[in-house]
């Protein structure tokens, strides 16, 4: 279809870099949640850190293009990276509008399809763009 | 600032491909940006043709998708526009174009392509 | 696509006079209730320049006597007060679908 995709705009404060350019913000006539309108793709992604006792939001927005998973209804999160000991970056790519707001489900820490607790390390910052 | 300039041959022969190309200073085109093709016929009507984004994706307008090819050439900063099968309806004056956004702020000066034998 | 309909195609003004330019659209170049509708001046021999993006934002550097306005459909153009650099042809553009499209132009000549 021709229509642009829109999606939910946030960027955790703290975050490095930003994929704001990536598209246009809209106005929504409320603060939160912002609205982003895709430039080059037509599919959100939304990225959230899961620790022990809850997952955080870090960024939502769109992608700079088209990939595997944008074909996805609905955002299921997949383990990406650890930014620190305990805690897991989780990632999803869906290609409806807004389909970035939420998780469908997320695993638990240390299930089975995380990464095992030696994975790799990463500063904050590069951990968000290594999950991108 | 963005500055961008068009350059190619001002007269092609009908079957045979158009080719031009973009040099944009002032601005990486790896930084941001979508980088246009615009033309406007001789009855001054515009048409969008595509794009090439900074991280080299593409889209193109469906009108011409079967004859259109935007690439970049990152070491010299120039994004060029191939249109084969030319015939005298590609007549046009060619812009190429830079957007942040979907409308067009940045503009080459354009150059006249005529399609003749 | 969609399709843009300018109105007048030309016409004949004095300086200081209000001039306005419509802009039809085929369907709403709306998103969630933003308008993606812009308006470019383009002068002989000179490429388009950028007036208003978003249906009513002015462009840096434009003079304040352009303004726009609209929604959905329907999309206008003014110039409060007609100066000789004025004097040129005006068009829309629409980027809320693929392929972005332009309106035909409205040719602003003295009267």
């Known amino acids: 279809p021709p229509n642009r995709r829109t999606c939910v705009f946030f960027e955790a404060p703290g975050v490095r870099g930003s994929t704001k350019t990536l598209g246009e913000l809209l106005d929504t006539g409320t603060e939160l949640p912002r609205a982003i309108r895709c430039l080059y793709s037509r599919c959100c992604f939304g990225i959230w850190n899961l620790t022990q006792d809850r997952a955080q939001v870090e960024m939502q927005g769109c992608r700079d293009s088209d990939e595997p998973g944008c074909e996805s209804l609905h955002c299921d999160p997949s383990p990406r990276a650890h930014p620190s000991p305990g805690s897991t970056l989780f990632t999803c790519s869906c290609g409806t509008d807004f389909c970035n707001a939420n998780y469908s489900h997320l695993p638990p820490p240390g299930s089975p399809g995380t990464p095992g607790s030696q994975g790799p390390q990463a500063a904050p910052g590069e951990s968000i763009w290594m999950a991108l | 600032q963005v500055q961008l300039q068009e350059s190619g041959p001002g007269l092609v022969k009908p079957s045979e491909t158009l080719s031009l190309t973009c040099t944009v200073s002032g601005y990486s085109i790896t930084s941001d940006f979508a980088w246009n093709w615009i033309r406007q016929f001789p009855g001054k009507g515009l048409e969008w043709m595509g794009y090439?984004?900074?991280?080299?994706?593409?889209s193109y307008n469906p009108s011409l998708k079967s004859r259109i090819t935007i690439s970049r050439d990152t070491s010299k900063n120039q994004f060029s526009l191939k249109l084969s099968s030319v015939t005298a309806a590609d007549t046009a004056v060619y812009y190429c174009?830079?957007?942040?956004?979907?409308?067009?702020?940045?503009w080459g000066q354009g150059t006249l392509v005529t399609v003749s034998s | 696509d969609i399709q843009l309909t300018q109105s007048p195609s030309s016409l004949s003004a004095s300086v200081g006079d209000r001039v306005t330019i419509t802009c039809r659209a085929s369907?709403?170049?709306?998103?969630?209730?933003?308008?993606?509708m812009h308006w470019y001046q383009q002068k002989p021999g000179k490429p388009p320049k950028l007036l208003i993006y978003r249906a009513s934002n002015l462009e840096s550097g434009i003079p304040s006597r352009f303004s726009g306005s609209g929604s959905g459909t329907d999309f206008t153009l003014t110039i409060s007060s007609l100066q000789p650099e004025d004097f040129a042809t005006y068009y829309c553009?629409?980027?809320?679908?693929?392929?972005?499209?332009f309106g035909g132009g409205t040719k602003v000549e003295i009267k």
């Open positions: 090439i984004s900074f991280s080299g994706s593409t």
């Open positions: 553009q629409q980027s809320n679908e693929d392929p972005y499209t």
């Open positions: 369907e709403s170049v709306d998103t969630y209730g933003n308008s993606f």
């Open positions: 174009a830079g957007s942040r956004y979907s409308w067009f702020a940045y």
